[in-house]
Interface confidence: medium
């Protein structure tokens, strides 16, 4: 038995370009949380798979809010390590997965929303009893710097907490039997002591107060027999009891199922069927409640506070898996139409519409200039999904609605002076100037620099734009 | 039945290497303790290497501490020793044997035992 | 390690006389905590690989007949056969599971 630690130094933007927008916001405060899953052995098993091992959940960090403009720092983290106990040996060889979950505190509907902004998984060998173990992983654009080890608890010791050690009983030797448990001189290793009153003949342990039963027997102390129907065993009846050894053993002879769990036998091996509260292979994993906090994104937890009734998380919309820890991608099923974007917001799905559609999947195409009228003789136009009209002279606005006052602009060059008009505008145009807007000079010799002058026109009268 | 069969022995010359084998079935292995145990010709039985139930703890004699590898693989039933640098010391017949439980319990089957020889 | 000494390295019997076999280890594999001494006895015959007696000292294993029997605390043990049979002629291993795993030398028992 141990313990597993995780000390997390940082987490915040990694090295090179691309830095992450801050996980918080003025508007939405938040702090950080961490989830660790430990799996023995050098497993490549998805992220859902049980942590056979063991799990923990940080606390929560301290709030944060971003400043303004500043690029996302090393965010506060919470204080103390992640401890995951392990019951039996040190596997040396594990898998793990370190998660790195945002708490929303702003006012979320139903409590504080929980989103998953990292995951990082490795693969690594360490010896129980070492140093720390320093890693960095990064995910994304963000990087997670952390320090791990495994330590035994007394009376474990050793490099993978198997070899049991005590106090010497007395100062110059180990007492009877015992090997000095090196490096601690001072302890002696211990045989097992299995759970009182397991049948010495029928019953074994490999962990202290265990009892685990020989093939042909049952129950807490192992001392019923299977079968005693008849003693077919080739090795026939135990001269200890009366009880019979079953022929033929099969799977789930003396019950690999921990913690009360049900054996049936498969095709090639077994499977327990576990009590609430308990999972894994043999159901030796022990129950998590509602009160350590197993339900994610705001799932709702439902079960018992003691650790024999296990727990259900009832997950938000967008959230799946047994802790609401797996975002469904409902964008992936393409909801939005006609080349809308899709938005996923967690707690709502939103469609960003093209122009020219509309509706909560941008299923309406719509007739730009239905129910448009455009004012005082304008024209409305289609194009581009909005609509737009094309006013008649003096008028102009969005609808036509405005009164046009085309001298605004200062549409007369050279110092000519505009007269706004019912059909227009008109430049009287300053001496030595002419043209519709006062942009030819007038030559010395009297000749325009225009061919020649509209009819009904002098050069030197007020040019009208036409 | 119990049964343990093993395998993997020969004729090896000294500071080779060589993998013993033992197909455990009858049982369900993945609940035993098992061990390997030598016995060099005319002479007593010397233990080599334990390993518990689920693989995860390894027991060795000081004679052979850092050459040989004790393992098992519990989805094929079967219990490994890897042995290297071997010495001409090393010669025996080597028996795989089931403890009755644990490791801290007594052995009671064992294989009939392949013979390992090194000789240059 | 513990060291298991056995004696005599060799006995022989009558049949139907009574054989006894003592074994002495270095240290107790009496522990105190569940009161059970780790000790087993084991008969090997000709070409055969070790087979189990008895486990805790004391306790027969199943299908071994009555007349062996194991007795003894600490320090020493004691392996006796009430009985000789012609069957039983062997050489007979204690072994110590306290710490690690250690045998006697081997007793070798013949008929007289």
């Known amino acids: 038995a141990g313990v597993f630690e995780l000390q997390i130094h940082s987490f915040g933007p990694g090295p090179g370009p691309g830095a992450p927008r801050s996980p918080c916001s003025a508007r939405l405060p938040c702090r950080l949380f961490f989830r660790v899953c430990l799996k023995p052995g050098l497993s490549e098993e998805a992220a859902e798979s049980p942590c056979a091992l063991g799990a923990a959940l940080s606390a929560r960090g301290p709030v944060y809010t971003e400043q303004p403009g500043a690029p996302a720092p090393d965010l506060p983290l919470p204080d103390g390590l992640l401890q995951v106990p392990f019951r039996d040996a040190w596997p040396g060889t594990f898998s793990f997965i370190i998660e790195t979950w945002r708490e929303e505190l702003g006012d979320q509907i139903g409590g504080p929303a929980w989103s998953l902004l990292a995951r990082v998984a490795g693969r690594r060998r360490l010896a129980a009893g070492g140093p720390w173990a320093r890693d960095i992983q990064r995910a994304g654009a963000w990087e997670l710097r952390f320090s791990y080890r495994a330590r035994c608890e007394p009376p474990a010791v050793g490099t993978a907490c198997t070899r049991l050690c005590r106090p010497r009983s007395a100062p110059s030797r180990c007492g009877p039997g015992l090997r000095p448990c090196a490096p601690l001189e001072d302890e002696c290793e211990a045989p097992l002591v299995c759970r009182a009153g397991c049948s010495p003949e029928h019953g074994f342990c490999e962990q202290p107060g265990e009892c685990r039963c020989l093939e042909g027997w049952t129950g807490p102390l192992c001392t019923v027999p299977v079968s005693t129907s008849s003693c077919l065993s080739p090795r026939g009846p135990s001269s200890a009891t009366t009880g019979c050894l079953v022929p033929g053993p099969g799977p789930c002879d003396g019950n690999p199922c921990a913690n009360g769990g049900s054996c049936s036998e498969t095709p090639r091996s077994f499977e327990c069927t576990c009590p609430r509260g308990f999972y894994g292979l043999r159901c030796e994993v022990s129950g998590v409640t509602c009160a350590d906090g197993p339900c994610f994104n705001g799932g709702l937890c439902v079960g018992g506070a003691d650790p024999d009734s296990a727990y259900i998380c009832h997950c938000p919309p967008g959230f799946q898996g047994s802790n609401c820890e797996k975002r469904v991608d409902r964008c992936s099923l393409q909801p939005c139409r006609n080349g809308g974007l899709c938005l996923d917001l967690g707690h709502a799905l939103r469609c960003r519409c093209r122009a020219g559609f509309a509706g909560p999947r941008c299923e309406h195409d719509l007739d730009d200039c239905a129910g448009r009228a455009c004012a005082n003789g304008g024209t409305c136009v289609e194009g581009g999904g909005a609509h737009r009209c094309s006013c008649a002279l003096g008028f102009g606005g969005r609808d036509c609605r405005e009164r046009a006052d085309p001298c605004a602009a200062r549409p007369c060059a050279h110092g000519g002076r505009c007269y706004a008009h019912f059909s227009g505008l008109v430049c009287a145009c300053a001496p030595g100037y002419m043209g519709a807007r006062c942009e030819f000079p007038v030559h010395p010799d009297g000749a325009s620099a225009l061919p020649a002058a509209p009819p009904g026109l002098r050069p030197g009268d007020p040019q009208r734009y036409l | 039945e119990v049964q343990l069969l093993e395998s993997g022995g020969g004729l090896v010359q000294p500071g080779g290497s060589l993998r013993l084998s033992c197909a455990a079935s009858?049982?369900?292995?993945?609940?035993?303790?098992m061990s390997w145990v030598r016995q060099a010709p005319g002479k007593g039985l010397e233990w080599v290497a334990a390993?518990?139930?689920?693989?995860?703890?390894?027991y060795y004699a000081d004679s052979v501490k850092g050459r040989f590898t004790i393992s098992r693989d519990n989805s094929k039933n079967t219990l490994y020793l890897q042995m290297n640098s071997l010495r001409a010391e090393d010669t025996a017949v080597y028996y795989c044997?089931?403890?009755?439980?644990?490791?801290?319990?007594?052995?009671?089957?064992w294989g009939q035992g392949t013979l390992v020889t090194v000789s240059s | 390690d513990i060291v298991m000494t056995q004696s005599p390295d060799s006995l022989a019997v009558s049949l139907g006389e009574r054989a006894t076999i003592n074994c002495k280890s270095s240290?107790?594999?009496?522990?105190?905590?569940?009161?059970?001494?780790?000790l087993a006895w084991y008969q090997q015959k000709p070409g055969q690989p070790p087979k189990l007696l008895i486990y805790?000292?004391?306790t027969r294993e199943s299908g071994v007949p009555d007349r062996f029997s194991g007795s003894g605390s600490g320090t020493d043990f004691t392996l006796t056969i009430s009985s000789l049979q012609a069957e039983d002629v062997a050489v007979y291993y204690c072994q110590q599971y306290y710490t690690y795993l250690t045998f006697g030398q081997g007793t070798r028992l013949e008929i007289k």
């Open positions: 044997a089931r403890h009755r439980g644990g490791y801290y319990y007594a052995m009671d089957y």
């Open positions: 805790w000292a004391s």
């Open positions: 009858g049982f369900t292995f993945s609940s035993y303790a």
């Open positions: 240290q107790s594999l009496l522990y105190s905590s569940n009161q059970k001494n780790y």
């Open positions: 390993i518990n139930s689920n693989g995860g703890r390894n």
